[in-house]
Structure formats: structure tokens, C-alpha cells
């Protein structure tokens, strides 16, 4: 016997109890693909969430977080509040970075300044709560006579033009 | 956590009516689609019915005398019997999912059900 759901189309559901007849999705629900029993009840962005797409027959609703959240997890399937640059969200809420690390984003985690000493360079410019340390060339790159691989550039003395 | 409480069962004379109610708590219903079924003593479970959306789908068996309504703002959904059978005689489920119907469907929360004796 030939299964007559498979004809059903999406946005459709094939209803066993009336010989396998295709009835359309009621509102709010959808079907992707053809030859379903059932329809799926579409998602509602309520509360923390904002709709991005409406759901309709055969799509489900797709949602954001409104202002002040950002999405977190598989199609933004929760909101986390916001925090500043140079704070972290904690259990109480959003709290500054502390001492020696930093955050450049509105979410995720504080993290430490890099360690430029680990690589055998100097600290050019201080790091922040908001950004991280910038490194430059290795104390014994500064010290006069060392090698480089790219020689700078001789100075212009007063009164000389460069040989 | 979510919690279904069925009510409005007991014993009824042939011809007679009933309205079952489900109530949730610990979520409303405005996510889910809201089901009914029966299980007769020695028989399987049997679906009775689905609630989505103002749309209602309804088990082959019941020849139009059962209705599933929803009162929203009571978070509550009613299954009227009218002209009652004896072969109606079972334990009446309330239940919920993200599939309509839920003919085929495994539903996500199911409550404990309420008695319906149709006996003269």
C-alpha cells in the first residue's frame, strides 16, 4: 500500500485519521519538509528576545536578544546581559576586570594581559581593563649594536643627508 | 518544572456530559500544543485530541462529541464529552508538546489524568 503521506508537502501534515489527507499547518506552527505527521510549533520570541524572521508554514521563527543582550548558544537559544568593556558578567552581576587582565568585548570572560616576557619582549604600551598589553621588540633588540632583520632606517643628522 | 492537573472527572449516566479541565503551572500553555488521552482498563492509550493556536484535531473515535477549548486567561484547557458512551469509560490525560497533533506524538509532560466512569 502506497504511503500517500510522502505527497504532503511542507507546510502541510498528513492526518492518518482522515485517510492520510493533507491538512495545512493551524497558524503558529510549520512544517519543513513534506511527508511529516505532525507540525512543529513555532518558536516565540518573547520576553529577552526579539523576532529576526517570522516564523511561517514551512520556517520556524528566528530570534535576537533585544538591546542590552547578546544570543548565547545554538540559534540564540538564550540571552546574557551586556556588560562594558572591561568588566566581566559574574553570578552578581557585571564587575570590572581585575588587576592584570582585561576584556574588549560586551561579553565573555576577563582575561590576562599577554605575558610579553615569555616571548623575550618588552611592554610598549601598559595594558588596561578594556585592552590588552602591547609588546614590542625584546629588551636586547633596543641596546645599541644588537642585529635586526629589518636594520632601521640611520637617523638624519642636523646639516647630513643619509649616505 | 511543569505540572498538569486534570479535574471534572466521575461517574456519568449514558447520554450524560462532562467537562474535563487541564491547569499548568510552572509554564503556560502559549508554548506548547495541548493534548488529550484516554487509556481503558486492559487497552491501550488512545488519542482524543489536540489544541494549537484556535485549531483543534480530534481522534477518528469521537464523531464530533468532544470539543477541546482553552481559556487563556485561566491557563486552562477543557475537553467537553457530551452524549457519553460507557466505551468512554477510562482515565483521561491531559498533555503537552511542540507537535500538533499529537496523534503520533510522544508528549513532553503528561499529568497524573482523571477518572471518567460512564455507567448507569
Known amino acids: 500500500l502506497q504511503d500517500l503521506c510522502s505527497n504532503c508537502p511542507a507546510g502541510t501534515f498528513c492526518d492518518n485519521n482522515r485517510s492520510q489527507i493533507c491538512s495545512p499547518c493551524p497558524p503558529n506552527s510549520f512544517s519543513s519538509a513534506g511527508g511529516q505527521r505532525t507540525c512543529d510549533i513555532c518558536r516565540q520570541c518573547k520576553g529577552v528576545f526579539k523576532t529576526r524572521k517570522e516564523c511561517s508554514s514551512t520556517s520556524n521563527a528566528e530570534c535576537d536578544c533585544i538591546s542590552g543582550y547578546h544570543c548565547l548558544g545554538a540559534e540564540c537559544s538564550m540571552c546574557e546581559q551586556d556588560c562594558k568593556q572591561g568588566q566581566e558578567l559574574t553570578k552578581k552581576g557585571c564587575k570590572d576586570c581585575c588587576f592584570g587582565t582585561f576584556n574588549d568585548q560586551k561579553r565573555g570572560i576577563c582575561r590576562p594581559w599577554t605575558n610579553c616576557s615569555l616571548d623575550g619582549k618588552s611592554v610598549l604600551v601598559n595594558g588596561t581593563k578594556e585592552r590588552d598589553v602591547v609588546c614590542g621588540p625584546s629588551p636586547a633588540d633596543l641596546s645599541p649594536g644588537a642585529s635586526s632583520a629589518t636594520p632601521p632606517a640611520p637617523a638624519r643628522e642636523p646639516g647630513h643627508s643619509p649616505q | 518544572e511543569v505540572q498538569l492537573v486534570e479535574s471534572g472527572g466521575g461517574l456519568v449516566q449514558p447520554g450524560g456530559s462532562l467537562r474535563l479541565s487541564c491547569a499548568a503551572s510552572?509554564?503556560?500553555?502559549?508554548?506548547?500544543?495541548v493534548g488529550w488521552f484516554r487509556q481503558a482498563p486492559g487497552k491501550e492509550r488512545e488519542y482524543v485530541g489536540t489544541?494549537?493556536?484556535?485549531?483543534?484535531h480530534y481522534g477518528d473515535f469521537e464523531n464530533n462529541r468532544f470539543t477541546i477549548s482553552r481559556d487563556n486567561a485561566k491557563n486552562t484547557v477543557y475537553l467537553q464529552m457530551n452524549n457519553l458512551r460507557p466505551e468512554d469509560t477510562a482515565v483521561y490525560y491531559c498533555?503537552?508538546?511542540?507537535?500538533?497533533?499529537?496523534?503520533?506524538?510522544?508528549?513532553?509532560?503528561q499529568g497524573q489524568g482523571t477518572q471518567v466512569t460512564v455507567s448507569s
Open positions: 498533555a503537552i508538546s511542540l507537535k500538533y497533533p499529537m496523534a503520533t506524538v510522544t508528549p513532553d509532560y
Open positions: 510552572g509554564r503556560t500553555f502559549d508554548n506548547y500544543a
Open positions: 489544541y494549537w493556536s484556535g485549531y483543534a
